[in-house]
Amino acid sequence: MKVLQEPACVSDYMSISTCEWKMGGPTNCSAELRLLYQLVFQSSETHTCVPENNGGVGCVCHLLMDDVVSMDNYTLDLWAGQQLLWKGSFKPSEHVKPRAPGNLTVHTNVSDTVLLTWSNPYPPDNYLYNDLTYAVNIWSENDPAYSRIHNVTYLKPTLRIPASTLKSGISYRARVRAWAQHYNTTWSEWSPSTKWYNSYREPFEQR
């Protein structure tokens, strides 16, 4: 049994780090492999993660952690029974992928404006809470040529779009993702998308 692609891990900077790797051949990850992890810290214990399959040769493991701080460093050991397949280390603060924003809602009852709101995925006491900026993707299923990215660089998880900039009488979808500038993170996954119908019509005298 051999590791083809070494484990690569990202942290949500809250409670979970996700490690993915590829094996040299088809593997029943949960039955054959264990990923052991241990914080390099006084009296810390070794913890075990049972991986899941992620495609035929891919494995993924969700490491449960306490809150993350910048000093944290983990040793990682990938075992197949009594055989050590790979040994490495992982510093969560240097490999952060934020959680996806949630509760994306579209408010169309505001005059002349489409208001999108969503929730910050972190609690206020988390370091990422005040560091997230967002990208909102809006597209139309009726108009394949229409797709826009709106960068939200302020802290408030809202975006206002003049309804007049969207075509009337067709449906739109929106989704949002996040990243944290000062932690040099990757982008989060996209939130689930939400759909709305743009019924806005310009006043008669502006037509």
Partner: antibody, heavy 125, light 112 residues
Framework: EVQLVESGGGLEQPGGSLRLSCAGS????????MTWVRQAPGKGLEWVSS????????YYADSVKGRFTISRDNSKNTLYLQMNSLRAEDTAVYYC??????????????????WGQGTTVTVSS | DIVMTQSPLSLPVTPGEPASISCRSS???????????VDWYLQKSGQSPQLLIY???KRASGVPDRFSGSGSGTDFTLKISRVEAEDVGFYYC?????????FGQGTKLEIK
């Protein structure tokens, strides 16, 4: 009530051996690291050894490394310190203390918040 | 090893007056914000040590609020706002960031 009770101290000749015990009660013993601290007559406190809750991680002061062995029996809620090749400078009151909660991924530290009453070890010919 | 240096080593205090003990470490004891791995212990005559303050500034259960800890990094202070007769004994700071845990030399607090 959370309590630690040491036993096993006594008078021993240089080169001899003693085994100290520390019985814990009133808390989930296996979840916590444990520590031994000693105090020579008229002197300050000196850390001796620590062990994680599972017993997998063990630490010693240089002054006792290779001579003392810390261990625990979680089924008996008891911590041990096996002391071999004793020297005159090992003469001290030995205290066991409850250390950090070590079952969490990052051990939770609340200080050495419970101490035993101490057991006296005298090494003399 | 981390060296812990306490001062003063002797502290005569009038009851009702404040007292302050300093502890300096040879390297930083801050692991993360709010987590300085330094404790303060009081050992009264003929007794086991008892925990007063842990993680730099957190008061242990049952410890009177006249005891407080402060500081960060390498410089730490234990303050007693109003000393009482029962506070006499030896005060020790200790670092537990890494083994070997190390103690200060101890400060003897006595009543004038």
């Amino acid at each position: 009530e959370v309590q630690l009770v040491e036993s096993g101290g006594g008078l021993e000749q240089p080169g001899g051996s003693l085994r100290l015990s520390c019985a814990g009660s009133g808390f989930t013993f296996r979840d916590f690291a444990m520590t031994w601290v000693r105090q020579a007559p008229g002197k300050g406190l000196e850390w001796v050894s620590s062990i994680s809750g599972s017993g997998d991680n063990i630490y010693y002061a240089d002054s006792v490394k290779g001579r003392f062995t810390i261990s625990r029996d979680n089924s008996k809620n008891t911590l041990y310190l096996q002391m071999n090749s004793l020297r005159a400078e090992d003469t001290a009151v030995y205290y066991c203390a409850k250390d950090r909660l070590s079952v969490t991924v990052r051990p939770r530290y609340y200080g050495l918040d419970v101490w035993g009453q101490g057991t006296t070890v005298t090494v003399s010919s | 090893d981390i060296v812990m240096t306490q001062s003063p080593l002797s502290l005569p205090v009038t009851p009702g007056e404040p007292a302050s003990i300093s502890c300096r470490s040879s390297q930083g004891l801050l692991y993360s914000i709010g987590y300085n791995y330094v404790d303060w212990y009081l050992q009264k005559s003929g007794q086991s040590p008892q925990l007063l303050i842990y993680l730099g500034n957190k008061r242990a259960s049952g410890v009177p609020d006249r005891f407080s800890g402060s500081g960060s990094g390498t410089d730490f202070t234990l303050k007693i706002s109003r000393v009482e007769a029962e506070d006499v004994g030896f005060y020790y700071c200790m670092q537990s960031l890494q083994t070997p845990y190390t103690f200060g030399q101890g400060t003897k607090l006595e009543i004038k």
